[in-house]
């Protein structure tokens, strides 16, 4: 029942043991020996799907939003619900599926062809409306296959970093994602507070390269919090 889901924070449904699974190709970390890998799939399937209780959209998956499961239901009981497809009703961007955003109460396509002219207008709307936040854009970045061009090169549209060539990562650019260079030592990087931090970041930088982490530049330690410069530095 939903109540038992909401009242429990314990880890459940641990998989039974199974002899050594193979590592993931191209991964520098090991697979888990003694762990069952359902269907051999690294990512979650939604068989026996149990709703996840939430307080905000950021707690849900990238194709979900947080809301009461019933119309006019108890506002205190919220779960992650499947995103809404194009032309469905919405109250905020996070309700719309990847590649869409909420405009005038309807999920509409955010593909580059007709979206660019509405960027400025949408930002204005978002600041003036409690129900319309840019948080949705930070997560709704999946693009339809028709928008792909040369795979993997810098500037190519992507879904995830594995779509990009070596030395590149998949990062937001407006409300699509493109392959950008992984940051090198000394380059400026972005350090977020983890929770809900990506909302206004429409030009996202890549992460720092191997052996580097994003830290405050030493000569900026005395600067105010808002002006601290972070750069990629050796561990």
């Amino acid at each position: 029942t939903l109540n038992s889901v909401l009242n429990s924070n314990a880890i459940k449904n641990l998989p039974p043991p199974l002899g050594g699974a193979a590592g993931h190709p191209g991964s520098a970390v090991s697979a888990a020996p003694g762990i069952l890998y359902p269907g051999g799939n690294k990512y979650q399937t939604i068989d026996n799907y149990q709703p996840y209780p939430c307080a905000e959209d950021e707690e849900c998956g990238t194709d979900e939003y947080c809301a009461s499961p019933t119309r006019g239901g108890d506002a205190g009981v919220q779960i992650c619900l499947a995103c809404r497809k194009r032309r469905k009703r919405c109250m905020r961007h996070a309700m719309c599926c990847p590649g869409n955003y909420c405009k005038n109460g309807i999920c509409v396509s955010s593909d580059q062809n007709h979206f660019r002219g509405e960027i400025e207008e949408t930002i204005t709307e978002s600041f003036g409306n409690d129900h319309s936040t840019l948080d949705g854009y930070s997560r709704r970045t999946t693009l339809s296959s028709k928008m792909y061009h040369t795979k993997g090169q810098e500037g190519s549209v992507c879904l995830r970093s594995s779509d990009c060539a070596s030395g590149l990562c998949c990062a937001r650019h407006f409300w699509s994602k493109i392959c950008k260079p992984v940051l090198k030592e000394g380059q400026v990087c972005t350090k977020h507070r983890r929770k809900g931090s990506h909302g206004l970041e429409i030009f996202q930088r890549c992460y720092c390269g191997e052996g580097l982490s994003c830290r405050i530049q030493k000569d900026h330690h005395q600067a105010s919090n808002s002006s601290r410069l972070h750069t990629c530095q050796r561990h």
Partner: nanobody, 128 residues
Framework: EVQLVESGGGLVQPGGSLRLSCAAS????????MGWFRQAPGKERELVAA????????HYADSVKGRFTISADNSKNTAYLQMNSLKPEDTAVYYC?????????????????????WGQGTLVTVSS
């Protein structure tokens, strides 16, 4: 490419404390859940604790509730497991793990081992 390096394991007496660290690199830390698993000799690997990508949710195995605390420091791309009131039965190899934010998340997502990439592990021995 996901890289996870654990540290902080060692020998500790029953009732003592340890803090494990997991240095992560090669991925956007903000977009991953971090977990700690453990595997005792002759036993299956079990998830001890996990923290969500939003940092707002933590999940614990019943056996460690009230004793262990998972946390993450985004400024250092590091996850931690603070272990207090350690017992001999906590003796195991502890593995750091990272799971990407999925399209859809369910109650069982954090406890499903196949969602995670893994570090090499650090040994924790609780003995007098």
């Amino acid at each position: 490419e996901v890289q996870l390096v654990e540290s902080g394991g060692g020998l500790v007496q029953p009732g003592g404390s340890l803090r494990l660290s997991c240095a992560a690199s090669g991925f956007n830390f903000d977009d991953y859940a971090m977990g700690w698993f453990r595997q005792a000799p002759g036993k299956e690997r079990e998830l001890v604790a996990a923290i969500s990508w939003s940092l707002s949710r933590t999940h614990y195995a019943d056996s460690v509730k009230g004793r262990f605390t998972i946390s993450a420091d985004n400024s250092k791309n590091t996850a931690y497991l603070q272990m207090n009131s350690l017992k001999p039965e906590d003796t195991a190899v502890y593995y750091c793990a990272a799971a990407p934010r999925p399209k859809r998340v369910s109650v069982s997502y954090f406890s499903t081992a196949s969602n995670y990439d893994w570090g090499q592990g650090t040994l924790v021995t609780v003995s007098s």
